[in-house]
Structure formats: structure tokens, C-alpha cells
């Protein structure tokens, strides 16, 4: 049994780090493998993560970490029984993938303005709470070419757009994702999408 693709890990900078790797053949990850992780700190002990299958030869492990501080550094040991398959290290603050925003809502009753709001995925005491910016993706269910991205570079989790920038009488979907420049994070996963029917009064044309 060998590791084909070494573990790579990302942290949500809150409570979970996720490590993924590939073995050289079909593996029952939960029965055959264990990922041990230990904070580099004199008084720490190793914690065990039981991996799950992620495709035939792929494994994924969710490491519980309460929370993260920037100095944290972990040693990682991947074991198959008594055999050490791989040894590495992981600094969560250098590999951050934020949690996805939630509760995306489209408010269509504000004159001819669309107001999109969503929830920050972090509690106020988490460092990332005040450092997230967002990208909102809006697309038409009828027209694949009608696909747009709005960058929200301010902290407030909301976006206002004129309903008239979209076509009237058709259905649209929206989703949102987040990232934090301070830790040069990757983008979060997209939030679940929400759907609405776009309709607005065409401005009266005078001839």
C-alpha cells in the first residue's frame, strides 16, 4: 500500500481542517488508514482522524481543531496499521479556505432594486469575520450566456443591483462565495443557490 498523491490540507480557520489524498489503488480508508495530527507544542498529544472514502482510491479526513491561531503548526502522520506511509506538516493559517456564506436571500420588493443578502459564515469573535469579501454569481436559467459575477469588496454581506440590469419576465439564480485577502485564502465553495422571477416595470417611453 502506497500513497500516490500526498495529502493536501485546507483550514476553515474555525474548527475543521480537511485533508485529501490518493492511494495507489482501491482502499477502504476508514478501516485501513489513520491520519494522526499533533500541534507542534511541548505539552500536546497526537489526535487521530479516521478518513472517509472520496472515490475509489481517494481519502478525505476532517481534523477537529477547536479554533486556529496564526502560529499553529501541525505534524501529520499517515498510518496503515503499523506502517508509516507519509509524514508531513501543515500550518492552517497558510492554507485557508473560508466557509461558504449561507442564507442567501433575494429581496424583490424594494422598488425596482434587487437586494441580495447573505450571512457571514463566521462568528464575530473569529478573525475572518471582518476580513471577508465576496463574489456574487447571477445567471439566467433560460440563457446560459446570461451569466455575471459581482465583486463585493466591502464588508457588508449584501448587494444592490437595479432589476433592469437583468431581463424581465424570466427566472434567475444567484449564489455567493467568500475569500479573505489577509490570509491569501482560496475561494470558499459556493453557497446554495436561490431562485427568483425577475419582473419590473419598463420605463414609460415618450415619443
Amino acid at each position: 500500500m502506497k500513497v500516490l498523491q500526498e495529502p493536501t490540507c485546507v483550514s476553515d480557520y474555525m474548527s475543521i481542517s480537511t485533508c485529501e489524498w490518493k492511494m495507489n489503488g482501491p482502499t477502504n480508508c476508514s478501516t485501513e488508514l489513520r491520519l494522526l495530527y499533533q500541534l507542534v507544542f511541548l505539552l500536546s498529544e497526537a489526535h487521530t482522524c479516521i478518513p472517509e472514502n472520496n472515490g475509489g482510491a481517494g481519502c478525505v479526513c476532517h481534523l477537529l481543531m477547536d479554533d486556529v491561531v496564526s502560529a499553529d503548526n501541525y505534524t501529520l502522520d499517515l498510518w496503515a496499521g503499523q506502517q508509516l506511509l507519509w509524514k508531513g506538516s501543515f500550518k492552517p493559517s497558510e492554507h485557508v479556505k473560508p466557509r461558504a456564506p449561507g442564507n442567501l436571500t433575494v429581496h424583490t420588493n424594494v422598488s425596482d432594486t434587487l437586494l441580495l443578502t447573505w450571512s457571514n459564515p463566521y462568528p464575530p469573535d473569529n478573525y475572518l469575520y471582518n476580513h471577508l469579501t465576496y463574489a456574487v454569481n447571477i445567471w439566467s436559467e433560460n440563457d446560459p450566456a446570461d451569466f455575471r459575477i459581482y465583486n463585493v469588496t466591502y464588508l457588508e454581506p449584501s448587494l444592490r443591483i437595479a432589476a433592469s440590469t437583468l431581463k424581465s419576465g424570466i427566472s434567475y439564480r444567484a449564489r455567493v462565495r467568500a475569500w479573505a485577502q489577509c490570509y491569501n485564502t482560496t475561494w470558499s465553495e459556493w453557497s446554495p443557490s436561490t431562485k427568483w422571477h425577475n419582473s419590473y416595470r419598463e420605463p414609460f417611453e415618450q415619443h
Epitope: L39, F41, L42, L43, S44, E45, H47, M65, D67, A71
Partner: antibody, heavy 121, light 106 residues
């Protein structure tokens, strides 16, 4: 709500022994390292000992090494400190304290009310 | 062993004052530095962990900074209830405490 309650303190003669206990509730006891810290009269806080969540790892400050033994019973949510060969310098209020994080290294977020140990002839 | 040195050992200040307590480690401890408040007859209370993170429920007038060997606890606007002894603690190695700073309100 997290609660830590020490017991077993008292008045003891030099050279004597006693066992301090700390009853824990309100959190998953077995996943957190636990600690003993003491405050001697007119002195500052002194870390005494740490035990890992599983009980497999223990550590002590130099002045108590070989005389003090930390242990835990995860089935009873209890932490212990066995103190042997007591000296006057061991007179202090002894606190049990919970690690803030499962992985450690960010201090102690919950403390008991303390147990007074007085060593005197 | 890592030694922690706090200064000053005591200070007196008035309500509303900005107060700073410093802590120096004998070697680099990264940001593994915590601050506690202890009042007579009471258990210590965690104020700041990891040098600058405010523990839940602690008033925002308390803040911490620093990394490596030099750290600071700041109380931005002193309140009467802040009269206490303050301790720094490193948790990079064995959990050494500083000797404490006794803060008195004038």
C-alpha cells in the same frame, strides 16, 4: 455550563501526603488536557502539572517532579493530584484548570474555585 | 525553561486611564502568550489568548499585542472593577507564568 470543583485540601504536616480531586462537568472531559496551577501566599501563579486528554502524557514543573502525580479518570470526569513528601513551600491554593482548546497552547479557560493546602508542623 | 518577566510589578492609575503592562519571554514563543486577571480570593480569568485574541465575554477595553519575545496587555479605559493582579503566561513550552502585575485604582 462548565464547572470544575476541587476537593481534598487541608492542613498537613511536613513529609505528609494528600490527594486533591477535581470534579468536572459541562464539557467532553476526555478530549481536553487538564492542569493544576497553584498560588502560594504572597507569590504569583505557578503551573504545577498537565495531563493530556487520554491520560497518556503528563508533565510537571521541576520543583514537584517525583513528588506529585497527576492522573485522571475519564469515566468519572475526575482529575487528581497526588502530593507526597510535602514541604512548607507547597503551601498554596491549588486550582484545576481546563485547556481552552483540544489541541492546547492557548491557555486555560475554566478554573475551579481552588483547594487550600497548608503544610505546617 | 522559558522565563517570563512582567513589568511593572505594580502600578496605580485612575479610572478612565489607559494602562499598559508588558511581558518579555527569555526566548521566542511565537504568539503563544496568554493574559489572566486574578482578584483576591478568586480564580484567575483568561482575558487574552494567542497574544491578541479576546476571550469570549471579556470587555473590549482589554487588548493584547506582540509576538516573539515582547508582548503587551492594554486596558484602554480603566474601570474600577479592573483592580486586580494580571499575569502573562506562555504556552509555547511548559506553562510558565510571569510574576504578576498588581493594578490599583486611585
Amino acid at each position: 455550563e462548565v464547572h470544575l470543583l476541587e476537593s481534598g485540601g487541608g492542613f498537613i504536616q511536613p513529609g505528609g501526603s494528600l490527594r486533591l480531586s477535581c470534579a468536572a462537568s459541562g464539557f467532553t472531559f476526555s478530549t481536553y488536557a487538564m492542569n493544576w496551577v497553584r498560588l502560594a501566599p504572597g507569590k504569583g501563579l505557578e503551573w504545577v502539572s498537565t495531563i493530556s486528554g487520554s491520560g497518556g502524557f503528563t508533565s510537571y514543573t521541576d520543583s514537584v517532579q517525583g513528588r506529585f502525580t497527576i492522573s485522571r479518570d475519564n469515566s468519572k470526569n475526575k482529575l487528581y493530584l497526588q502530593i507526597n513528601n510535602l514541604t512548607a513551600e507547597d503551601t498554596a491554593v491549588y486550582y484545576c484548570a481546563k485547556d481552552r482548546r483540544i489541541v492546547g497552547a492557548t491557555g486555560f479557560d475554566y478554573w475551579g474555585q481552588g483547594a487550600l493546602v497548608t503544610v505546617s508542623s | 525553561d522559558i522565563q517570563m518577566t512582567q513589568s511593572p510589578s505594580s502600578l496605580s492609575a485612575s479610572a478612565g486611564d489607559r494602562v499598559t503592562i508588558t511581558c518579555r519571554a527569555s526566548q521566542s514563543i511565537s504568539s503563544y502568550l496568554n493574559w489572566y486577571q486574578q482578584k483576591p480570593g478568586k480564580a484567575p480569568k483568561l482575558l487574552i489568548y494567542a497574544a491578541s485574541s479576546l476571550q469570549s465575554g471579556v470587555p473590549s477595553r482589554f487588548s493584547g499585542s506582540g509576538s516573539g519575545t515582547d508582548f503587551t496587555l492594554t486596558i484602554s479605559s480603566l474601570q474600577p472593577e479592573d483592580s486586580a493582579t494580571y499575569y502573562c503566561q506562555q504556552s509555547y513550552g511548559f506553562h510558565t507564568f510571569g510574576q504578576g502585575t498588581r493594578l490599583e485604582i486611585k
